[in-house]
């Protein structure tokens, strides 16, 4: 059989070899495709619902006005010329659809060395057959499960069109001494040969040195965290990491419902503000890092130091973020 590839939605003409150029003709077409249960026979007379899918032209060729996925299969023509010589034509038809240009979505602008980082997700929509996605670093293919590279793939099929959507999520663990501005790209390779790959626009995240865990410092003002009623306590979370991570605050092990900020001000301290405070630094592509906990307590008039073991209620009082 002769292999024929046709683009979905495009017309296709299959020649019936040996058929007379004009009627009368003695020929028949047999089809075994996704539209047929077994072999379907089409004659030059045509007519009926099949004409919208495939019909025999006056010259004996078979014409499909818009090829679809269901038209994949075997097409055979048997023709007899004026002298009674029989000729057979045999075609294996495969269809394809080139997707739109693949895209990298949810791409990271920053990665951290020494830990797994999600670089991004490559998405290709509208291919047939499915094809494959592959990742490249500086134009060279990245091999999954090698040197800190892992890829999670997903293939979905559209329930109506039958076209495929491919997704590929790239995770990398940058090793020491690598390029601080690596160039990642992703390419779609069609499932049928003779079609060139489609490549995404590249992304160039920055790779940062990891932040040592012990570097999240919590500074309390006044020192010691003991304050008279109505006084102010300022908690500052110092993280030398660059770029600055997001800082959230915890009280007695519970996250405070406040927007991220490196400074927490507790003005007009009351009993409800007493407790143990810590800050949590969340670096992009890095696990959260918690500071040491500090105890904030109220010194009652006439007392010298923090009230032993005093932990106030769960109320927040008035909180200010700088």
């Amino acid at each position: 059989a002769q292999n024929i590839t046709a683009r979905i939605g495009e017309p296709l003409v299959l020649k019936c070899k040996g058929a007379p150029k004009k009627p009368p003709q003695r020929l028949e077409w047999k089809l075994n495709t996704g539209r047929t249960e077994a072999w379907k026979v089409l004659s030059p007379q045509g007519g009926g619902p099949w004409d919208s899918v495939a019909r025999v032209l006056p010259n004996g060729s078979l014409f499909l006005p818009a090829v679809g996925i269901q038209d994949e299969g075997i097409f055979r023509c048997q023709a007899m010329n004026r002298n009674g010589k029989e000729t057979k034509s045999n075609y294996r038809v495969r269809v394809y659809q080139i997707p739109g240009k693949p895209e990298i979505v949810d791409s990271a602008s920053e990665l951290t060395a020494g830990v797994p980082n999600k670089v991004g997700t490559c998405v290709s929509e509208g291919s047939y057959p499915a094809g494959t996605l592959s990742w490249h670093l500086d134009g060279k293919p990245l091999v999954p499960n090698e040197k800190g590279v892992s890829v999670k793939e997903q293939t979905r099929r559209h329930p109506e069109t039958g076209l495929f959507t491919l997704q590929s999520e790239l995770m990398v663990t940058p090793a020491r001494g690598g390029d601080p501005r690596p160039t990642f790209s992703c390419s779609f390779s069609p499932g049928l040969p003779r079609h060139r790959a489609l490549r995404t626009a590249p992304i160039q995240p920055r790779v940062w040195e990891p932040v040592p865990l012990e570097e999240v410092q919590l500074v309390v003002e006044p020192e010691g965290g003991a304050v008279a009623p109505g006084g102010t306590v300022t908690l500052t979370c110092e993280v030398p990491a660059q770029p600055s991570p997001q800082i959230h605050w915890m009280k007695d092990g519970v996250p405070l419902p406040l927007p991220p900020s490196p400074v927490l001000i507790l003005p007009e301290i009351g009993p409800q503000d007493q407790g143990t405070y810590s800050c949590v630094a969340t670096h992009s592509s890095h696990g959260p890092q918690e500071s040491r906990a500090v105890s904030i307590s109220i010194i009652e008039p006439g007392e010298e130091g923090p009230t032993a073991g005093s932990v106030g209620g769960s109320g927040l009082g008035t909180l200010a973020l700088a």
Epitope: D138, P180, W208
Partner: antibody
């Protein structure tokens, strides 16, 4: 103690090629990138190329066609090759360690090797 | 490619005084600038990276500042060993040096 030492031919004839070696001690080139930078007499510094710990390379786009960088991890050596030399390639050539990922920059430099292009 | 314009190209100053050198990038370099001291017969020496972080062993008389496209490098209480040529380097995208500033004594 981190040390980088460049060695080269000193004199190169025009249109010939230049080969320089950087021999490294005090750190491993499997953990750090190494750059080549040059300085023509009386002029400023010009970055040429870098080879990263994994062997990947990044070149100055204007000189890429004439440059080639490679390394031998077992000997702790980095090599620079430059083709089709002209008189304006006369310069002091330095190899430089890259300090790490961001926010670090090039940190330790060799003392340089002088290259004169002349017939 | 990013261009770095360093000024002044030379600077005459007195010992004990303060000097400031500037570098202007052709685009935002996100604070990825380093400053090097270069004395004749030696390789350059890193003094500051990431705009303002002092390399270990560098005295606090040296400082760096800036953001976006504009950056500066200052030396206060100038000492004789500070006489050298200073270069800025942007390393945000590839690597570009400024033209250098030669520091001299009045």
């Amino acid at each position: 103690q981190v040390q980088l030492k460049e060695s080269g031919p000193g004199l190169v004839a025009p249109s010939q090629s230049l080969s320089i070696t950087c021999t490294i001690s005090g750190f491993s080139i499997t953990s750090y990138g190494v750059h080549w930078v040059r300085q023509p007499p009386g002029k400023g510094l010009e970055w040429l190329v870098v080879i990263w710990s994994d062997g990947r390379t990044t070149y100055n786009s204007t000189l890429k066609s004439r440059l080639s960088i490679s390394k031998d991890n077992s000997k702790s050596q980095v090599f620079l090759k430059m083709n089709s030399l002209q008189t304006d390639d006369t310069a002091m050539y330095y190899c430089v360690r890259h300090g790490g990922y961001f926010p670090y920059a090039m940190d330790y430099w060799g003392q340089g090797t002088s290259v004169t292009v002349s017939s | 490619d990013i261009q770095m314009t360093q000024s002044p190209s030379s600077l005459s100053t007195s010992l004990g005084g303060k000097v400031t050198i500037t570098c202007k990038a052709s685009q935002d370099i996100n604070k990825f600038i380093a400053w090097y001291q270069h004395t004749p017969g030696k390789g350059p020496r890193l003094f500051i990276y990431y705009t303002s972080t002092l390399q270990p062993g560098i005295p606090s008389r040296f400082s760096g500042n800036g953001s976006g496209r504009d950056y500066s490098f200052s030396i206060s209480n100038l000492e004789p060993e500070d006489i050298a040529t200073y270069y800025c380097l942007q390393y945000d995208n590839m690597y570009t040096f400024g033209g250098g500033t030669k520091l001299e004594i009045k």
